[in-house]
């Protein structure tokens, strides 16, 4: 028979032969042959593989570094990685939770809608037209543009979401 060019699900092609992939939690020791099955071995104590695979090395479980404020939320198994979370009152910097912050700041152009608590991080909102924020802050709201009219001045430079308007003197030459 013709050697296969594609294999079934949970198989891989090697030496013109379809071999079974190793199941999650196991790594490849040796490929199958015409006479033998694929040989797989369970991952070690602090290792895992989360897919059907032909990996010769298992992945190390993630380390939740207490020096970064991390602790184990869910212990890893041979098939799953460890899930880290932050100490109480701290917040993950990303979905992968690789480090912790007390709270995040809102960038220029955004204001604080809600200050962080022990449970929820800072909630930011874009500054609407007529308001601005020129700082990175975890407490400051968007500030309204200066009203030049109330100071008997005129707008010399329009405001943006990151900058205030610039006021200047009235043009006295106008009729």
């Amino acid at each position: 028979p013709e050697p296969p060019t594609a294999c079934r699900e949970k198989q891989y092609l090697i030496n013109s032969q379809c071999c079974s992939l190793c199941q999650p939690g196991q790594k490849l020791v040796s490929d199958c042959t015409e006479f033998t099955e694929t040989e797989c071995l369970p991952c070690g104590e602090s290792e895992f593989l989360d897919t059907w695979n032909r990996e010769t090395h298992c992945h190390q479980h993630k380390y939740c570094d207490p020096n970064l404020g991390l602790r184990v939320q869910q212990k890893g198994t041979s098939e799953t990685d460890t899930i880290c979370t932050c100490e109480e009152g701290w917040h993950c910097t990303s979905e992968a939770c690789e480090s912790c912050v007390l709270h995040r700041s809102c960038s220029p152009g955004f204001g604080v809608k809600q200050i962080a608590t022990g449970v929820s991080d800072t909630i930011c909102e874009p500054c609407p037209v007529g308001f601005f924020s020129n700082v990175s802050s975890a407490f400051e709201k968007c500030h309204p543009w200066t009203s030049c009219e109330t100071k008997d001045l005129v707008v010399q430079q329009a405001g943006t979401n990151k900058t205030d308007v610039v006021c200047g003197p009235q043009d006295r030459l106008r009729a």
Epitope: L68, G69, E87, W90, T93, R104
Partner: nanobody, 116 residues
Amino acid sequence: EVQLLESGGGLVQPGGSLRLSCAASGFTFAGYEMWWVRQAPGKGLERVSAISGSGGSTYYADSVKGRFTISRDNSKNTLYLQMNSLRAEDTAVYHCAKEPYSYDYWGQGTLVTVSS
């Protein structure tokens, strides 16, 4: 290396006052918003007060409004928290914090105990 060193804590009677300091080094102090955060024994973190880099904007938690005053001296790279009319529930370790507020900037804090 960023360093934040809190001081000024101690034992005080209810109704008394204390002034906490936070000496900052390793960064351009005036360019950063700063916070005071406290942790009471067996409790979570509470964000107490914050001040903008220039000192022009401040924030106070409802629990301390009217009693605590945050300030900064950018020429001395120092943050302050003046605490008046202290109550038993103000007992906590007080920490100062700077953006980006990461855990590895977290100092030892200074312990404030309000008791008669």
